[in-house]
């Protein structure tokens, strides 16, 4: 039963991680920025992995698509595929787990194959955590590296003079919302290979068999299994490390057919 | 990369009227304040008129209800229509521009064009 929760419970974590991540992805507010040298209106600029958004405090707003991918910053680019990876990985992940759950029953699956499924997408889930966390942190590292606060520096340029807008790059709602959704699918999938773990199915229940020696009142037990018919206390035949043999006395011994060779 | 290009300076009698236009070209990805800055022989460069991406104005108080700041977004320009002009009114007019850059959408740069000279005199 403990299981089957633990298993449920990383589905169900995992799920909303990379509904999260999903949402993150999506989102247009990785980093927003205040401009400040603009005397007429409060302009607040907010920008995603897909597009770049105006508004002012007018209530104008207009978003524009990176419509180019060659002429991209290389870490945006890094960013977005890690992201995409994570997503992928976690839909993977979220498919071949609902197959993998115990609570579903398909065909005649048995629980080794059913075993391999929840680490398959626990890993699965844990390499998608991975990569939304480290896309997020890449990012946040971009804009604290390069964008905290940009100074306003002049130098001329083709057709007069340049400078850089004096703005203040701050993290944006989907840096949080990655990851917190990239450590949900984290922990959903190591649930999911603890769950494994209780799935995997037991040794094979060996039946111990004591042999009579003529002669002599030991009983012999091959592999330090305590002999039993399976009606006694030790029903699950328990490996015993008592680096020895016990006389009949100590073991009670019942006859079979094999007592003898 | 990027140019501004202002036009329509020239010489004009007092009361008169000229109409200054600005275009952005190059690698732009997106514009978002335009404005006109003005700098006299011998005097400080000062904001005559800025209008946001939004159509938001602002005009300095020697030119409010003569001036008049208009964008079109499509072109990436910015016109002033100069009406009852004065002799103080003279000038280097200069375009300026905040926008970024389609390499780099996450960093925000001013531009400034070369300048349009207006002079007001009879």
């Known amino acids: 039963m403990a299981v089957t929760a633990c298993q449920g419970l990383g589905f169900v974590v995992s799920l909303i991680g990379i509904a999260g991540i999903i949402a993150a992805t999506c989102m247009d507010q990785w980093s927003t920025q205040d401009l400040y040298n603009n005397p007429v209106t409060a302009v607040f600029n907010y920008q995603g992995l897909w597009r770049s958004c105006v508004r002012e405090s007018s209530g104008f707003t207009e978003c524009r698509g990176y419509f180019t991918l060659l002429g991209l910053p290389a870490m945006l680019q890094a960013v977005r595929a890690l992201m995409i990876v994570g997503i992928v990985l976690g839909a993977i992940g979220l498919l071949v787990s609902i197959f993998a759950l115990k609570c579903i029953r398909i065909g005649s699956m048995e629980d080794s194959a059913k075993a391999n499924m929840t680490l398959t997408s626990g890993i699965m889930f844990i390499v998608s955590g991975l990569c939304a966390i480290a896309g997020v942190s890449v990012f946040a590292n971009m804009l604290v590296t390069n964008f905290w606060m940009s100074t306003a520096n002049m130098y001329t340029g083709m057709g007069g003079m340049v400078q850089t807008v004096q703005t203040r790059y701050t993290f944006g709602a989907a840096l949080f919302v990655g990851w917190v959704a990239g450590g949900l699918t984290l922990i959903g999938g190591v649930m999911m290979c603890i769950a494994c773990r209780g799935l995997a199915p037991e040794e094979t229940n060996y039946k111990a068999v004591s042999y009579h020696a003529s002669g002599h009142s030991v009983a012999y037990k091959p592999g330090g299994f305590k002999a039993s018919t399976g009606f006694g206390s030790n029903t699950k035949n328990k490996k015993i490390y008592d680096g020895g043999a016990r006389t009949e006395d100590e073991v009670q011994s019942y006859p079979s057919k094999h007592d003898y060779v | 990369q990027v140019q501004l290009v202002e036009s329509g300076g020239g010489l004009v009698q007092p009361g008169g009227s000229l109409r200054l236009s600005c275009a952005a070209s190059g690698s732009i990805f997106l514009i978002n304040a335009m404005g006109w800055y003005r700098q006299a022989p011998g005097k400080q460069r000062e904001l005559v008129a800025v209008?946001?991406?939004?159509?938001?104005?602002n005009y300095t108080d020697s030119v409010k209800g003569r001036f008049t700041i208009s964008r079109d977004n499509a072109k990436n320009t910015v016109y002033l229509q100069m009406n009852s002009l004065r002799a103080e009114d003279t000038a280097v007019y200069y375009c300026?521009?905040?926008?970024?850059?389609?390499?780099?959408?996450?960093?925000?740069?001013?531009?400034w064009g070369q300048g349009t000279l207006v002079t007001v005199s009879s």
């Open positions: 300026n521009a905040d926008l970024n850059l389609r390499s780099d959408p996450f960093k925000w740069y001013t531009f």
């Open positions: 209008i946001t991406r939004g159509g938001s104005a």
